[in-house]
């Protein structure tokens, strides 16, 4: 039960996270005009990864796309790339994890395959989350640098009558959405990796032991132990007897060759 819950929760958390990463990538408010000096502005500027916008106090909003590719700052291109990589990895991870879910049966897919798929999707979610967090953090760092540079310019070179006051930008909503979404995707990925440990049947090293059935004969089903996924160390050897009590995680709905004694 715990493994199924962990896997399911990991999937849901990752799904929310990836949806958030997509939303953040599409949002226009990555940076917003700093209103510290002029809280009642007639023109409010904000910028995203793909276009910059102006909300006029008259109530109209106009956006202009970045139609150039080569003319854009390298950092912005890097952030775009990180976010897109994060989305692609996350989307593939979601696709893989759907088939890996314990509650979904596809033909006679072995638990080992599901465990491997769970691990794969988990790793993808972790990388996806890290990409998003990295992308947002790079953009935030760029904003902080530009903010202090424009602040410095604001208080120098004011000898003439004309003040070319630069518009300063601060963190927009998309940054916070991106950080939270990246974190959720990362947590979801970790949960999937943890679930993978519970899904993988442990490799048992059986010594030559003489079993004596007392009273009545017990049929032993030989072999068929699955190879360990190599994720974590398997110390417990679960011996499950036919007809014995099972935890919900160990119950299988169809007879299987993996009912071990």
């Amino acid at each position: 039960m715990a493994v199924t819950a962990c896997q399911g929760l990991g999937f849901v958390v990752s799904l929310i996270g990836i949806a958030g990463i997509i939303a953040a990538t599409c949002m226009d408010q990555w940076s917003t005009q700093d209103l510290y000096n002029n809280p009642v502005t007639a023109v409010f500027n904000y910028q995203g990864l793909w276009r910059s916008c102006v909300r006029e106090s008259s109530g109209f909003t106009e956006c202009r796309g970045y139609f150039t590719l080569l003319g854009l700052p390298a950092m912005l291109q890097a952030v775009r790339a990180l976010m897109i990589v994060g989305i692609v990895l996350g989307a593939i991870g979601l696709l893989v994890s759907i088939f890996a879910l314990k509650c979904i049966r596809i033909g006679s897919m072995e638990d080992s395959a599901k465990a491997n798929m769970t691990l794969t999707s988990g790793i993808m979610f972790i990388v996806s989350g890290l990409c998003a967090i990295a992308g947002v953090s790079v953009f935030a760092n760029m904003l902080v640098t530009n903010f202090w540079m424009s602040t410095a310019n604001m208080y120098t070179g004011m000898g003439g009558m004309v003040q070319t006051v630069q518009t300063r930008y601060t963190f927009g909503a998309a940054l916070f959405v991106g950080w939270v979404a990246g974190g959720l995707t990362l947590i979801g990925g970790v949960m999937m990796c943890i679930a993978c440990r519970g899904l993988a049947p442990e490799e048992t090293n059986y010594k030559a032991v003489s079993y004596h059935a007392s009273g009545h004969s017990v049929a032993y089903k030989p072999g068929g132990f699955k190879a360990s996924t190599g994720f974590g160390s398997n110390t417990k050897n679960k011996k499950i007897y036919d007809g014995g009590a099972r935890t919900e995680d160990e119950v299988q709905s169809y007879p299987s060759k993996h009912d071990y004694v």
Epitope: A42, Q47, S52, V54, S57, S58, R64
Partner: antibody, heavy 118, light 113 residues
């Protein structure tokens, strides 16, 4: 057709108040800011403030902040500008003007002359 | 507050000649978000309210004759009347819509020489 019709000329005593009205027609009154601008005889244009009738939000020029009150009545599509503690230098033509795309004043009322005289 | 300074205060031009009015802002009026300058030009004839001519520094309002044109960016702007007509005699004002309070230039009186 967009039209802004203002109330008639007023003669006021110093220290009193004046309330000028501006009736809008031909557009969705609640969806556009309404500005008030004044022009003293032979002088330039001076922005006083604005109101968004849909919400009642207002913005005022610092110069008039303490003396001007701008209101709007959505039911009659009318904006009002009240100026208190009148002085002789408040003698001017007061205009209402719709605020539009590009932060411009695209339609103007015909103006209301307010004369402050003892 | 943003200060707009128009020059000259008055201008006399012969009919059919070119008239140029300047407007200088104490601060940039260029918006980074849409790369537009929030400067507007109005024409006011005696006894009438102002009439919108040009917005965003260079966009002509519909119905305005094409002899009127606006140019400039940042802090320096120009209104040009390519061929002055008798009906163009008026006072011309520039106005900024970039920051509150909204401000106007002091006006330029255009007359026929």
């Amino acid at each position: 057709e967009v039209q802004l019709v203002q109330s008639g000329a007023e003669v006021k005593k110093p220290g009193s108040s004046v309330k000028v009205s501006c009736k809008a027609s031909g557009y969705a009154f609640s969806n556009y800011w309404m500005n008030w601008v004044r022009q003293a005889p032979g002088q330039g244009l001076e922005w006083m403030g604005q109101i968004y009738p849909g919400s009642g939000d207002t913005k005022y020029s610092g110069k008039f902040q303490s003396r001007v009150t701008i209101t709007a009545d959505k039911s009659t599509s009318t904006a009002y500008m009240e100026l208190s503690s009148l002085r002789s230098e408040d003698t001017a033509v007061y205009y209402c003007a719709r605020f539009y795309y590009g932060n411009v004043m695209d339609y103007w009322g015909q103006g209301t002359l307010v004369t402050v005289s003892s | 507050d943003i200060v707009l300074t128009q020059s000259p205060d008055s201008l006399a031009v012969s009919l059919g000649e070119r008239a140029t009015i300047n407007c200088k802002s104490s601060q940039t009026l260029l918006s980074g978000g849409n790369q537009k300058n929030y400067l507007t030009w109005y024409q006011q004839k005696p006894g009438q309210p102002p009439k919108l001519l040009i917005y965003w520094a260079s966009t002509r309002e519909s119905g305005v004759p094409d002899r009127f044109s606006g140019s400039g960016s940042g802090t320096d702007f120009t209104l040009t009347i390519s061929s002055l007509q008798a009906e163009d005699v008026a006072v011309y004002y520039c106005q900024q819509g970039y920051s509150y309070p909204l401000t106007f230039g002091q006006g330029t009186k255009l007359e026929i020489k």
